[in-house]
C-alpha cells in the first residue's frame, strides 16, 4: 500500500521577490512533486503564514540550512512529513494550491497545525 495516500499537496506557482527576515521564520517544506509546476521551498513564518521561495536562490539555500541546524539543535527527532492541513494564513505574495497526493512535501517544524485560510483544495486522481 502506498503511504499516506490522501496527504495534501502544496504547489507554488510564483516565488516571493523579497528576502524574508530569518527571524520571522519557524520552518520550511521542500516541494518536489511532479504534480507541481516547479520545485519550491515553502517557508512557514512564526505567524503561520506560508511563503513560496525559489530554492535556487542563495539566500533561500542559506536559510534552509540554518533552519536545519536550528531544528537539530532544538529537537533532533521532530522532522516529519506533511500529512495534515496546511499550516497557514493566506500565503504571502504567492499562489498556493492544495491537491491530494501521497507525501507531496517534507515539513521541518516542531509545532502543531493551525487553520488554513485562502488555499484552494482539489483532489488529484
Amino acid at each position: 500500500q502506498p503511504d499516506a495516500v490522501n496527504a495534501p499537496l502544496t504547489c507554488c506557482y510564483s516565488f516571493t521577490s523579497k528576502m524574508i527576515p530569518m527571524s520571522r521564520l519557524e520552518s520550511y517544506k521542500r516541494i518536489t512533486s511532479s504534480r507541481c509546476p516547479k520545485e519550491a521551498v515553502v517557508f512557514v513564518t512564526k505567524l503561520k503564514r506560508e511563503v513560496c521561495a525559489d530554492p535556487k536562490k542563495e539566500w533561500v539555500q542559506t536559510y534552509i540550512k540554518n533552519l536545519d541546524r536550528n531544528q537539530m539543535r532544538s529537537e533532533p527527532t521532530t522532522l516529519f512529513k506533511t500529512a495534515s492541513a496546511l499550516r497557514s494564513s493566506a500565503p504571502l505574495n504567492v499562489k498556493l494550491t492544495r491537491k491530494s497526493e501521497a507525501n507531496a512535501s517534507t515539513t521541518f517544524s516542531t509545532t502543531t497545525s493551525s487553520t488554513s485560510v485562502g488555499v484552494t483544495s482539489v483532489t488529484v486522481n
Epitope: S34, P37, K38, E39, K56, D68, L79
Partner: antibody, heavy 117, light 107 residues
C-alpha cells in the same frame, strides 16, 4: 509526467571524449538542476556534477573538475555531459537526474559508455 | 568531502523478515539523507528523502530514521519485490556522496 530520456550506448577509445545527452519532458529544466551520476560495473553510485540550466552555472565533484563539462539547451530541454581524456576506469553507466535540493527523484534510463582500445 | 559508510554491504533475508540497513556520515548532515533502491539494469529509485519522508507511491513497510551522523532504513516485512541494492546519499553539501550500497539477497 516527468521523463528523462538519454542517448544510446557509446564505445570509445582511451584518450577520446564522449558526450551524453538527456532530454527532459514534463518539466521546464530552467526550474530545476540537472545532475549527472555514474556507476561503474558492479560498483556504487558516484556524483559527477550538476548544472543550473537557467544560467549555465555548474558544480562538480573535484575528481571530475576540468575533465567533465555539463551544458544545457533550454530550447530543447536537453542536458549534456561530456567527459574527456577517457580511460578504462570511465567505463560505466552514466545517469542524468533532476533535483534542486541535491537528492534525485527522477532519473534517466542510463547510458552505457565503454572505454576500450 | 563527506564520506558515507553503509552497512552491511550485503545481507540474506527471507520474505517477511524485518531488514535494517545503516548509514553513517563523517559529519553531521542534519537529516539531509536520501535512500534509493536499485534493481539490476535499472536506474535507482528514490524511496526516502529528508531521512524520514517517504516518496509518493513507496510502500509504508519502508521507513527511515536517524539524525546527526547516523541513519537507518528499515523494511518492516520484506516482500519478493524488495530484493535489490539500497544506497544512502547525503545532500547536505556538494559533492553529494553515496554509501557503498547494501545488496539484499534471498536466503
Amino acid at each position: 509526467q516527468v521523463q528523462l530520456v538519454q542517448s544510446g550506448a557509446e564505445v570509445k577509445k582511451p584518450g577520446s571524449s564522449v558526450k551524453v545527452s538527456c532530454k527532459a519532458s514534463g518539466l521546464n529544466i530552467k526550474d530545476t538542476y540537472m545532475h549527472w551520476v555514474r556507476q561503474a560495473p558492479g560498483q556504487g553510485l558516484e556524483w559527477i556534477g550538476r548544472i543550473d540550466p537557467a544560467n549555465g552555472n555548474t558544480k562538480f565533484d573535484p575528481k571530475f573538475q576540468g575533465r567533465a563539462t555539463i551544458t544545457a539547451d533550454t530550447s530543447t530541454s536537453t542536458a549534456y555531459m561530456e567527459l574527456s581524456s577517457l580511460r578504462s576506469e570511465d567505463t560505466a553507466v552514466y545517469y542524468c537526474a533532476r533535483g534542486v535540493f541535491g537528492f534525485f527523484d527522477y532519473w534517466g534510463q542510463g547510458t552505457t559508455v565503454t572505454v576500450s582500445s | 568531502d563527506i564520506q558515507m559508510t553503509q552497512s552491511p554491504s550485503s545481507l540474506s533475508a527471507s520474505v517477511g523478515d524485518r531488514v535494517t540497513i545503516t548509514c553513517k556520515a563523517t559529519e553531521d548532515i542534519y537529516n539531509r539523507l536520501a535512500w534509493y533502491q536499485q534493481k539490476p539494469g535499472k536506474a535507482p529509485k528514490l524511496l526516502i528523502s529528508g531521512a524520514t519522508s517517504l516518496e509518493t507511491g513507496v510502500p509504508s513497510r519502508f521507513s527511515g530514521s536517524g539524525s546527526g551522523k547516523d541513519y537507518t532504513l528499515t523494511i518492516s516485512s520484506l516482500q519478493p519485490e524488495d530484493f535489490a541494492t539500497y544506497y544512502c546519499q547525503q545532500f547536505w553539501s556538494a559533492p553529494y556522496t553515496f554509501g557503498g550500497g547494501t545488496k539484499v539477497e534471498i536466503k
